[in-house]
């Protein structure tokens, strides 16, 4: 069961994995969460009653009957992993730890004017987990205002004392702070040398790169394949480093594959979640159980459920025994990952989808893009909603998209006139504007934020969040989109749709099923070609076909210009401005949203 | 017509900056590695640098390395090269080239080349 | 580093001849490796990569065999405009590193 509340003066006795420095009891839960084994742990805080060497120990355990004996201990404060709960988990930490030192190795030392100029510096850095930043109270002069950045193999502190005048904090590149550019592709035929830090076995390089990236020290990998001709590292997963961060040398080996950690994008990617299926592949590991299963999706649900399994393997049923029913044996390792990979023996094997609620929810599959036609169908656009205003009487404002359970991203310029958030109305789910009547279930506006800089939708900053009166449950109806990550500006996005109820042609009407339309990027430089008498700036993306005939219009407005990528949607573009419609050589003008993803996530991450 | 057409190269002194530019053009730019290669008066070829199709990973030449700098604007077709702290053994045809095949390493479309003189 | 070495470095023949050049690398590169054919005063020409096989567009009296350290290459049949300069490249691994040059000429 789930268990969030941390247990004050308690300590678990036994079970111990191992032990990691963390400046806080809810960190410890976060670690202890993102651990591949750990079930509980006892954290220590600073207590005088405390010898210092075991301030801030965050003990990972173990057990396999998930819980542990409980011990009474001053400053112990001891609770459970969230892998037992449903709910979303976050890596993320922003807290500023005042008056402690984190230690690690001290890669880089320079300058900074505060605190959060330091944390910039290491979210923004390849290396660095952590930092400790010398405030100018600090008692010695040349160290005042120096930022440490440091970084360990475990990403998390060495020890951790108490300095006065210092503040120490983690990285943001898990909370999509980070700047750093993502390589996402995968490069066949190609082997990397440098400092292998760790391996471990892997089906695919698909699931290499997951381990890779949220493995704290992995900048890129390997993957010799089922085919590499050296048989005893084939499914072999090379974790690597380098001092400059990338690859000193590419070298080209037949049936080995290799790419990058997507530490910097990896709220907009699948890390943990492992959802294929291997077969006539056997994942050997410690077997935890082994239990009859109708089918390889039912082992692997089996496998969720039980929460110590990290992955399974499962063996069909020969003919007519057991009720047609196959054996499912339930494994787990030191690491998550299987001791070895055989082929041949006619096993299917796959992950725990446990740890899925590790990602971000916006990376979950949706079901395939219909193709052809303009009107939408059900579940298409699980982010797309409608944004009602019912004064004076009710109708369709704009569009909007599902971006976290509370928020809705929209433009700026629908809410013109709109004195009050009491008039609008949310709606989620809808394929058909018929389909809302009286009693069709809404989500109130608790407030509109827009963007300060905003004045009108031709000038840009033309973004608007709005914060729902209550969470919004997601389903395959209703989802939220992920953001671009900062570190794909680079991405030239081939595979991109404007959706909404809008006009068809400037003078029509609001439509009645939600419309969809292919439209390609058009560069800035061509954009700015086409308005010659406004201003393109960088923080607007183009879109539309040089011949016109297909473009957002009005009604369209702040919805979605999505784009997918690596098999994920991602939001580049909100609705904002253009000449007409759809007509010739002039593209319609999106607010780029990869420009505004840290003013979204201040406003929504806001405490 | 698949097309690479370099420009920016000319006489500088020792020690000097230049940048050369390579426009691309008849094939998806955006997804192939690009690379330099140089060839000194009456020389062999000599591989300077290579950049990812991305922009994020770039490769060099011992010789060249921390003073050459290679990059890539994807929107408008161009490969770059910002050649710092140049020296006489800099002197050659910069031909810029596609990289070809399943891990590149082959160069199947070449520019015609543009020539960087390094003297006082 | 890898080092390639091309040999003759330079070749006199008459219209019609079999022509070889051979290459050897300092390691093995596998069958990594390309030939290039350069004209006076122009651009480098992908003829052969990965040892043998011929680039679209190329004459099939072109050829290349070879793998490990050792590499051929062949014109069956040489024709006038076949003049150049003949460079091997390994592209086994980064640094990527050209053999000298083979200037064909003909008799």
């Known amino acids: 069961e789930c268990v969030t509340q941390l247990l004050k003066d308690t300590c678990f006795e036994g079970g111990d994995i191992t032990t990691v420095f963390t400046p806080s009891a809810k960190y410890c839960q976060v670690v202890c969460t993102y651990h591949p084994r750990c079930l509980l742990f006892t954290f220590t805080a600073e207590s005088p009653s405390e010898d210092p060497t075991r301030w801030f120990t965050c003990v990972l355990k173990d057990s396999v009957t998930e819980t542990l004996p409980r011990v009474n201990r001053t400053a112990a404060i001891s609770g459970y992993s969230f892998k037992q709960c449903s709910h979303q988990i976050s890596a993320c930490n922003k807290d500023i730890y005042v008056d402690l030192d984190m230690k690690g190795i001290n890669y880089n030392s320079s300058v900074a004017k505060s605190a959060q100029e330091c944390q910039e510096r290491c979210t923004d850095d390849v290396h660095c987990h952590f930092f400790t930043y010398a405030t100018r109270q600090f008692p010695s002069l040349e160290h005042r205002n120096i930022c440490l950045l440091k970084h360990t193999q475990t990403g998390t502190p060495t020890r951790i004392t108490k300095l006065d005048k210092v503040v120490s904090g983690f990285s943001l590149k898990s909370c999509a702070l980070s700047n750093l550019a993502c390589i996402r592709d995968i490069f066949p035929n190609t082997v990397f040398a440098d400092s292998n830090i760790d391996s471990v076995m892997a089906p695919d390089a698909f699931v290499c790169g997951r381990i890779c990236t949220h493995h704290p020290g992995c900048l890129f990998f390997t993957f010799f394949s089922q085919e590499w001709p050296k048989e005893s590292q084939r499914n072999l997963c090379l974790l690597k480093t380098s001092e400059s961060g990338l690859p000193s040398t590419r070298i080209k080996k037949s049936k080995a594959l290799s790419g990058f950690s997507l530490q910097s994008c990896r709220h907009s990617i699948p890390v943990f979640c492992h959802s294929s299926f291997y077969h006539d592949t056997d994942f050997l590991g410690e077997e935890l159980d082994i239990v009859a299963a109708k089918s390889h999706e039912a082992c692997q649900k089996l496998c969720t459920n039980a929460v110590r399994c990290q992955f399974f393997t499962y063996t069909p049923a020969q003919a007519s025994c057991n009720e047609g029913k196959g054996k499912c044996y339930l494994k787990l390792s030191s690491n998550g990952s299987p001791t070895k990979i055989l082929h041949g023996r006619g096993g299917i094997s796959g992950y725990t989808l446990r740890l899925c609620k590790m990602d971000n929810e916006c990376t979950t599959k949706i079901k395939p893009r219909i193709v052809g036609g303009t009107a939408s169908v059900r579940g298409e656009w699980p982010w797309q909603v409608t944004l009602h205003t019912t004064s004076p009487t009710q109708r369709h404002l704009c569009g909007g998209s599902i971006i976290g359970n509370q928020w809705i991203l929209t433009a700026a310029h629908c809410f013109y006139g709109v004195e009050s958030p009491k008039i609008l109305r949310v709606y989620s789910g809808i394929l058909n504007q018929s389909e809302i009547k009286e009693d069709t279930s809404f989500f109130g506006v608790q407030e509109i934020i827009i963007h300060d800089q905003y004045k009108m939708a031709e000038s840009g900053y033309d973004i608007a969040l709005l914060k729902l009166e209550t969470t919004v449950n997601y389903t395959d109806s209703q989802r939220p989109i992920c953001l671009p990550s900062k570190g794909d500006r680079n991405v030239i996005y081939t595979d991109c749709w404007v959706t909404g109820w809008g006009y068809r042609k400037l003078r029509d009407k609001i439509q009645n099923t939600l419309q969809k339309a292919k439209i390609p990027l058009v560069t800035n430089e061509e954009c700015q070609k086409r308005y010659r008498g406004h201003k393109i700036t960088h923080k607007m993306i183009c879109a539309g076909y040089r011949e016109g005939g297909k473009d957002a219009c009005k009604g369209d407005s702040g919805g979605p210009l999505s784009c997918k990528h690596n098999e994920v949607w991602h939001l580049v573009g909100i609705t904002s401005w253009g000449e007409g419609c759809a007509q010739r050589e002039r593209p319609g003008v999106y607010t780029n949203v990869v420009e505004y993803v840290d003013w979204i996530l201040e406003k929504t991450q806001a405490v | 017509e698949v097309q690479l057409l370099e420009s920016g190269g000319g006489l500088v002194q020792p020690g000097g900056s230049l940048r050369l530019s390579c426009a691309a053009s008849?094939?998806?730019?955006?997804?192939?590695?690009m690379t330099w290669v140089r060839q000194a008066p009456g020389k062999g070829l000599e591989w300077v640098s290579s950049?990812?199709?991305?922009?994020?990973?770039?490769l060099y030449a011992d010789s060249v390395k921390g003073r050459f700098t290679i990059s890539r604007d994807n929107s408008k077709n161009t490969l770059y090269l910002q050649m710092n702290s140049l020296r006489a053994e800099d002197t050659a045809v910069y031909y810029c080239?596609?990289?070809?095949?399943?891990?590149?390493?082959?160069?199947?479309?070449w520019g015609q080349g543009t020539m960087v003189t390094v003297s006082s | 580093d890898i080092q390639m070495t091309q040999s003759p470095s330079s070749l006199s023949a008459s219209v019609g001849d079999r022509v070889t050049i051979t290459c050897q690398a300092s390691?093995?590169?596998?069958?990594?490796l390309n030939w290039y054919q350069q004209k006076p005063g122009k651009a480098p020409k992908l003829l052969i990569y990965?040892?043998?096989n011929l680039e679209t567009g190329v004459p099939s009296r072109f050829s290349g065999s070879g793998s490990g350290t050792d590499f051929t290459f062949t014109i069956s049949s040489l024709q006038p405009e076949d003049i150049a300069t003949y460079y091997c490249q390994q592209s086994s691994s980064t640094p990527l590193t050209f053999g000298g040059g083979t200037k064909m000429e003909i008799k």
């Open positions: 390691q093995d590169i596998s069958n990594y």
């Open positions: 080239a596609r990289e070809v095949g399943a891990a590149g390493f082959a160069f199947d479309i």
């Open positions: 008849g094939f998806t730019f955006s997804t192939y590695w």
């Open positions: 950049i990812w199709s991305s922009g994020g990973w770039t």
């Open positions: 990965d040892a043998s």
